[in-house]
């Protein structure tokens, strides 16, 4: 059997660190057997069998010029093997971050904090940490660890499915290369890393007969699970074309009627989502959708209770967003039963 421990990585490759002494091991001989060493492609002897170093070649203060293939052979000239030297650095602790687009699953991504220059893999696992009592800071013994399954095709991401929203998790990402391993531990709670995907299907439509109005509607992101206990609230922004500043409102449901649009101008609209109890952070903005108020006369309006925008239709104060409103709502896949009072008034 070979006297050379096989480091993780391709066969026949041995590893060292620049600036350090490197020992190469002749794989096809018995440990301690004296061998001769050559650089592949160079006939001069690098180290003879009388060196006292047995089956090893010692390169003091290796540098990039030492990288390449070496030939070792026994006393009688038999080929002991070929060894390729690759230089690089031991792993450093990877940079790890985790995010959740819903309240049941989360993913963690990582990247090296230093480039090692060597073949590298990552070991990913997690433990669940459960609080013993509501007032207690003590934690029960960790459960797990379980593997955090990695994405195929080498994407630097792993996904934990079926996570518990109220639990804390400890993520372990270990960077491994032939010169060692380095671990980053990260404590995460789903509540703090929750960031929904942006709402989908945003549509902006004119309201016939109302040159200052636009109706925006959207749906929950497809990634948000279909269960009624975790709802989303929304934030909507709009602005006329060429206008630099956004107006912001917090709709109560899955649509909003803008009443202070600029007549005749196309408007950009976008929406963002967040857990309705303010866990985590707002989603990124949806792609912008555009709409232009309709042209036409304004019918006489009947004053109505609970109207969303009661100010007269004058140029909007775009820098003063409407105050936030309560955003509890039924499950998104159900109908939004909020009456559009203004609509009723208009029809009357």
């Amino acid at each position: 059997s070979s006297p050379c421990p096989q480091a993780w990585g391709p066969p026949g490759v041995q590893y060292g660190q620049p600036g350090r002494s490197v020992k190469l091991c002749c794989p096809g001989v018995t440990a301690g057997d004296p061998v001769s060493w050559f650089r592949d492609g160079e006939p001069k002897l690098l180290q003879g069998p009388d060196s006292g170093l047995g089956h090893e070649l010692v390169l003091a203060q290796a540098d990039s010029t030492d990288e390449g293939t070496y030939i070792c052979q026994t006393l009688d000239g038999a080929l002991g093997g070929t060894v390729t030297l690759q230089l690089g650095y031991p792993p450093a602790r990877p940079v790890v971050s985790c995010q959740a687009a819903d309240y049941e699953n989360f993913s963690c991504t990582w990247s090296p904090s230093q480039i090692s220059g060597l073949p590298t893999r990552y070991l990913t696992s997690y433990r669940k940490k459960t609080v013993l009592g509501a007032d207690s800071q003590r934690r029960s013994p960790s459960t797990g660890p379980w593997p955090c399954p990695q994405d195929p095709l080498g994407a630097a991401r792993c996904v934990v499915h079926g996570a518990e929203f109220w639990s804390q998790y400890r993520i372990n990402v270990t960077e491994v290369n032939p010169l060692g391993a380095s671990t980053r531990l990260l404590d995460v709670s789903l509540q703090s890393i929750l960031r929904p995907d942006p709402p989908q299907g945003l549509r902006v439509e004119s309201v016939p007969g109302y040159p200052r109005r636009l109706r925006a509607s959207w749906t929950y992101p497809a990634s948000w699970p279909c269960q009624p206990h975790f709802l989303l609230k929304f934030r909507l922004q709009y602005r006329p074309a060429q206008h630099p500043a956004w107006s912001t409102v917090e709709p109560a449901g899955l649509e909003e009627v803008i009443t202070d649009a600029v007549a005749g101008l196309p408007h950009a609209v976008r929406v963002s989502a967040r857990d309705f109890l303010d866990a985590g952070t707002w989603s990124t903005w949806s792609p912008e959708a555009w709409g232009t108020p309709s042209t036409g006369t304004i019918p006489k309006e009947i004053p109505a209770w609970g109207q969303l925008h009661t100010q007269p239709e004058v140029e909007p104060q775009v820098d003063s967003p409407a105050p936030p409103r309560p955003s509890l709502q039924p499950h998104p896949r159900l109908l939004d039963h909020r009456d559009s009072v203004e609509q009723v008034a208009v029809l009357a």
Partner: antibody
Framework: QVQLQQPGAELVRPGSSVKLSCKAS????????MHWLKQRPVQGLEWIGN????????HYNQKFKDKATLTVDKSSSTAYMQLNSLTSEDSAVYYC??????????WGQGTLVTVSA | DIVLTQSPATLSMTPGDSVSLSCRAS??????LHWYQQKSHESPRLLIK???QSISGIPSRFSGSGSGTDFTLSFNSVETEDFGVYFC?????????FGAGTKLELK
């Protein structure tokens, strides 16, 4: 014991090719480099090249790069050297020698190649 | 290519004499120098490797020395079976090259 068997002589026509053989026995063929050398009375010994029988990796003397081609047949433990476009300058004794990377430890008896019309 | 110059070209000796053969390299080759003996109508055989390392089966009267550019093959007492041609060979760089040889003949 180590033996390298080479044919005693080859008579060849100018412009033609010849493939010299070297059958090895008495050792593990793929563990050692096989070298080929040329000897003429005035010019002395010249190294043509070597081949690693395990992977057929070769090193050639640039002088012979277009003249000689080294191959091996592991199944019969035989090394070959093909010489092409022969001229009178190629008349010589050709040796195969088992060695390490750069030394010639065991030599065949040599093949006398005579290039003559 | 590295050129090896051997001297003398011919050396006439009688059995029992001590002999020194010289090989000079055109550039420094450290200790990457080897010696071969070729008797009449025979193939060469390796005598000394890496300037001074002995070879199994070779009589101990053969010894080598030198480093850099100047090398010597010595035998402390020539025997009749030692007559023949002696070649030096370098393995410092490709192509591997030989000296032209020193012929050791009977006086």
């Amino acid at each position: 014991q180590v033996q390298l068997q080479q044919p005693g002589a080859e008579l060849v026509r100018p412009g033609s090719s010849v493939k010299l053989s070297c059958k090895a026995s008495g050792y593990t063929f793929t563990n050692y480099w096989m070298h080929w050398l040329k000897q003429r009375p005035v010019q002395g010994l010249e190294w043509i090249g070597n081949i690693g029988p395990s992977d057929s990796k070769t090193h050639y003397n640039q002088k012979f790069k277009d003249k000689a081609t080294l191959t091996v047949d592991k199944s019969s433990s035989t090394a070959y050297m093909q010489l092409n476009s022969l001229t009178s300058e190629d008349s010589a004794v050709y040796y195969c020698a088992r060695g390490d990377y750069v030394l010639f430890t065991y030599w065949g008896q040599g093949t006398l190649v005579t290039v003559s019309a | 290519d590295i050129v090896l110059t051997q001297s003398p070209a011919t050396l006439s000796m009688t059995p029992g004499d001590s002999v020194s053969l010289s090989c000079r390299a055109s550039q420094s080759i450290s200790n990457n120098l080897h010696w071969y003996q070729q008797k009449s109508h025979e193939s060469p055989r390796l005598l000394i490797k890496y300037a001074s390392q002995s070879i199994s089966g070779i009589p101990s009267r053969f010894s080598g020395s030198g480093s850099g550019t100047d090398f010597t093959l010595s035998f402390n007492s020539v025997e009749t079976e030692d007559f023949g041609v002696y070649f030096c060979q370098q393995s410092y760089s490709w192509p591997l090259t030989f000296g032209a040889g020193t012929k050791l003949e009977l006086k």
